[in-house]
């Protein structure tokens, strides 16, 4: 079958397709938007139907352009919309890692900095860059291993290799080896030179004179250096410090250069010696907003705002028509952030406050009149050849300084212009044309050719020299780059490629690695060549002092929890403990809480009372009532600790007052009287003629009531007084002090009364005797 011949009429390529011949056949090359033999069908893949990074392919389905999707791993379906169960589906990568499918069942995690492991689950041991001095860190189990460069060794490549300890020695021909951090240095004998003293020393070959110094041999192994200005030393290695007696003003810092010095000025000053005030208005063109005028001041600037604006930088809008009075019948139109005065004829200025000087046509014909918006005066813009306030004066071009006529042509002034009378051999309006020796372009490298009478002169571009400007000046000849910088000769300039740690046009500045304040938490930064060191404040560690030392590890708190601080810790003690480390058990027994002789035992944040028999309660404060069973038959029960005491009623005795005293036992009845025992007494049955209680007395002495506080008993020729409680004496007239026997127990206070006593008991005790 014959392929389409798109060059034939009726078979041309549609929709911008191009007909191209290849291998003897013609075919339509379609643009991206159309497909098919004649580019007749819209490209079905243009709408990106395949989702989830599936690839769309154009297929022919019975002559109609269709598409088919090749799905990315993990997806299926005609549009790649169906997610297959795969290893990345549940995002197994931890700590912000990104999951990449390798196969349906295998994945690889791209871990963020600081994490490693198949699923980013391990903190990366190399994240803190532990290997110093360019050592390569390799994670190993839960730690790391450092592969050190040849000049360093040790677990973190911080130990310098002593190259001078090698056998045989590195420095040859009797040279002395000096070990340095990361390298070594050979100090050679006068007869040899080279990094390892391997070459015989020939004075001035190569020249040891640095910084462009010229070498002159003065003997077999001696030389002399003639230094360029600004350098000194045996080999011109010292840049003379030009800073003593410098003229840097206003706090400028002197920076030594080669045979000169520069002043590093504070922000508000500039100029060679920091004497010129920095013009902030020039530095910040938008310092004053909304058309405000910037006025520089020493160490600052002021804004003069246009009407309608206010504020330090003229950013605040004012309702201008409220405060602005337009002059002389002008109409005020309020605008956003401004106002506009519509002036009547003959007036001008922002407020129509000026007379318009242009009304009177003060400028000469052909010039342009503008009104000065500040003072209303006319400003005439003159055409070429005229000058003066009204552009009415002719400019004498012949007396403006340089003769406008070249090659000594004579200048003749005319009204508004000038003419040149040329010397023989020259022509042109300004005598600029002569016989042109520059036609052959003799000047190279973009030089300017000056045609002269019978000759030419080449004015070279900067960086070139020679009659035809054919020689490129070597600006590197003077070795201007410091600190081993590499000099690249350019056209009319040079460029220094500085070693790491140095910068500046001449590599003259040591880069201050401390400028970015890498040291954290108040650490001091020590700058060095191409490095810095952080001296940490107390309580911090790490390369940048970023790690707060955990003073809680190991835990210093015995009986409590530890709270870490900066260079300190605080122990929050468990109840019952005290001390800086919670090491002291508080003795809760020190307040003697156990009463009635109870024994105290200290516990954690508590105590325990072991009570004596007869007492109870947490503090043994309760005395058990031994009188509860009423043990005293005929008497009052006094409760004691683990016991009681019976105070017997008169006439009774025994520990329980259950024995009636036999008052007849002593035969108290005289003169043959019969004794009858009673309670707390007896009765005598007297024989006739005797009558007193003991049958002694015929006369009753009790009739006169001699017993003041008691009962009278008549006796033979006398009487006896039985006193009321609390009284004593022959006649019961003496008030007894019942407190003398200390009847109040358990610390109770005794108060003597007329008849008896009263006990005031301590807290927790009661009863007549506080028992």
């Amino acid at each position: 079958a014959r392929g389409p011949r798109c060059s034939q009429p009726g078979e041309t390529c549609l929709n911008g397709g191009k007909c191209e011949a290849a291998n003897g056949t013609e075919a339509c090359v379609c643009g991206g938007a159309f497909v098919g033999p004649r580019c007749q069908d819209p490209n079905p893949c243009l709408s990106t139907p395949c989702k989830n990074a599936g690839t769309c392919h154009v297929v022919d389905r019975r002559g109609v352009a269709d598409y088919a999707c090749s799905c990315a791993l993990g997806f299926s379906g005609p549009l790649c919309l169906t997610p297959l169960d795969n290893a990345c589906l549940t995002n197994p990568c931890r700590n912000g890692g990104t999951c990449d499918l390798l196969t349906l069942t295998e994945y690889k995690c791209r871990c963020p900095p600081g994490w490693s492991g198949k699923s980013c689950q391990q903190a990366d041991p190399c994240a803190s860059n532990p290997c110093a001095n360019g050592g390569q860190c390799l994670p190993f189990e839960a730690s790391y291993i450092c592969h050190c460069p040849p000049s360093f060794h040790g677990p973190t490549c911080r130990q310098d290799v002593n190259e001078c300890g090698q056998k045989p020695g590195l420095c040859r021909h009797g040279g002395t080896c000096h070990n340095e951090v990361g390298s070594y240095r050979c100090v050679c004998r006068a007869t040899h030179t080279g990094p390892n003293c391997e070459r015989p020393y020939v004075p001035c070959s190569p020249s040891p004179c640095q910084n462009g110094g010229t070498c002159r041999p003065t003997g077999d192994v001696t030389h002399e250096c003639a230094c360029l200005p600004g350098f000194t030393g045996q080999n011109c290695e010292e840049n003379i410090d030009d800073c003593p007696g410098n003229n840097c003003k206003n706090g400028g810092a002197c920076v030594d250069g080669v045979n000169t010095y520069n002043c590093r000025c504070p922000p508000e000053w500039t100029g060679q010696y920091c004497t010129e005030d920095v013009d902030e208005c020039q530095l910040m063109p938008n310092a004053c907003q909304n058309g405000g005028t910037c006025h520089n001041t020493h160490g600052g600037y002021n804004c003069v705002c246009v009407n309608g604006w206010t504020g330090e930088d003229c950013s605040e809008n004012i309702d201008d028509c409220a405060s602005a009075a337009c002059f002389h019948g002008a109409t005020c139109h309020d605008r956003v952030a401004s106002f506009y005065c519509e002036c009547p004829h003959g007036r001008t200025g922002l407020l129509c406050h000026l007379n318009d000087a242009c009304i009177s046509n003060p400028c000469n014909e052909g010039s342009n009149c503008d009104t000065n918006p500040v003072n209303g005066k006319a400003i005439c813009t003159c055409p070429s050849g005229y000058t003066g306030p009204a552009c009415s004066q002719d400019v004498d071009e012949c007396s403006l300084g340089a003769n406008p006529c070249e090659h000594a042509g004579k200048c003749i002034n005319t009204l508004g212009s000038f003419e040149c009378q040329c010397l023989q051999g020259y022509t042109g309006p300004r005598c600029e044309i002569d016989v042109n020796e520059c036609v052959s372009n003799p000047c190279q490298n973009d030089a300017t050719c000056l045609d002269q009478i019978g000759e030419f002169q080449c004015i070279c571009m900067p960086g070139y020299e020679g009659v035809h400007c054919e020689v490129n000046t070597d600006e590197c000849a003077s070795s201007p780059c410091l600190h081993n910088g590499r000099c690249l000769d350019k056209i009319n300039e040079f460029q220094c490629e500085c070693p790491t740690g140095f910068t500046g046009h001449l590599c003259q500045y040591d880069v201050d690695e401390c400028a970015s304040t890498p040291c954290k938490n108040g650490a001091k930064c020590l700058d060095g060549p191409n490095t810095y060191t952080c001296v940490c404040t107390e309580g911090y560690t790490g390369t940048h002092c970023e790690v707060d030392i955990d003073e809680c590890d190991p835990d210093p708190c015995h009986y409590g929890s530890c709270k870490d601080g900066v260079a300190t810790f605080t122990c929050l003690c468990r109840p019952g403990y005290t001390g800086h480390h919670c090491e002291t058990n508080i003795n809760e027994c020190s307040s003697q809480p156990c009463r009635h002789g109870g024994t105290c035992q200290d516990r954690d944040n508590a105590y325990l009372c072991f009570c004596l028999k007869g007492t109870t309660g947490p503090n043994c404060e309760i005395n058990l009532d031994d009188c509860a069973s009423s043990p005293c038959d005929s008497g009052t029960c006094l409760d004691k600790i683990d016991g009681y005491e019976c105070a017997c009623e008169p006439g009774y005795t025994g520990s329980m007052c259950n024995i009636n005293i036999d008052e007849c036992a002593g035969n108290p009845c005289h003169n043959g009287g019969t004794c009858e025992d009673g309670i707390n007494g007896f009765t005598c049955r007297c024989p006739e003629g005797y009558h007193d209680p003991t049958c002694l007395s015929e006369v009753n002495e009790c009739n006169s009531n001699p017993c003041v506080h008691g009962a009278c008993r008549d006796s033979l020729n006398g009487y006896k007084c039985d006193c009321d409680p609390g009284w004593s004496g022959t006649n019961c007239d003496i008030n007894n002090n019942e407190c003398e026997s200390n009847p109040c127990v358990n610390g109770g206070t005794c108060k003597d009364m007329t008849s008896g006593y009263v006990c005031t008991c301590r807290e927790g005790f009661s009863g007549p005797n506080c028992q």
């Epitope: 169960d85 795969n86 290893a87 549940t90 197994p92 931890r94 349906l104 069942t105 295998e106 994945y107 690889k108 995690c109 492991g117 198949k118 699923s119 689950q121």
Partner: nanobody, 117 residues
């Protein structure tokens, strides 16, 4: 190879409940995200639910509100509690293990769940 023991698959009526369980060895279980996938006849295998080592869960839209996944770390077992079952839930249910230390996905042998009246 990872050893997984699945159980709990059965024939159940629509609206009924089932609990599937999957036991793994202690070393695999403690370092793996566990879960369940299913494959209905003539369809691709799809994720049903998953639970991370620290207990965060993920459910397919079809499982939300009806199914619950939880893991018993003491028994090294993951469970799928299935409620309000529908005929559409009929499939072979596979225990799935993503081994975080090896970076690999493993499936069990599968247990048949049939929802039919």
């Amino acid at each position: 190879e990872v050893q997984l023991v699945e159980s709990g698959g059965d024939l159940v009526q629509p609206g009924g409940s089932l609990r599937l369980s999957c036991a793994a060895s202690a070393t695999v279980f403690s370092n793996s995200d566990m879960g369940w996938s299913r494959q209905a006849p003539g369809k691709e295998r799809e994720l049903v639910a998953s639970i991370t080592t620290d207990g965060n869960t993920l459910y397919a839209d079809a499982a939300k509100g009806r199914f619950a996944i939880y893991r018993d770390n003491s028994k090294n077992t993951v469970y799928l509690e299935m409620n309000s079952l529908k005929p559409d839930d009929t499939a072979v249910y596979y225990c799935r293990v993503v081994d975080l230390l090896r970076g690999k996905l493993y499936w069990g042998q599968g247990t048949q769940v049939t929802v039919s009246s």
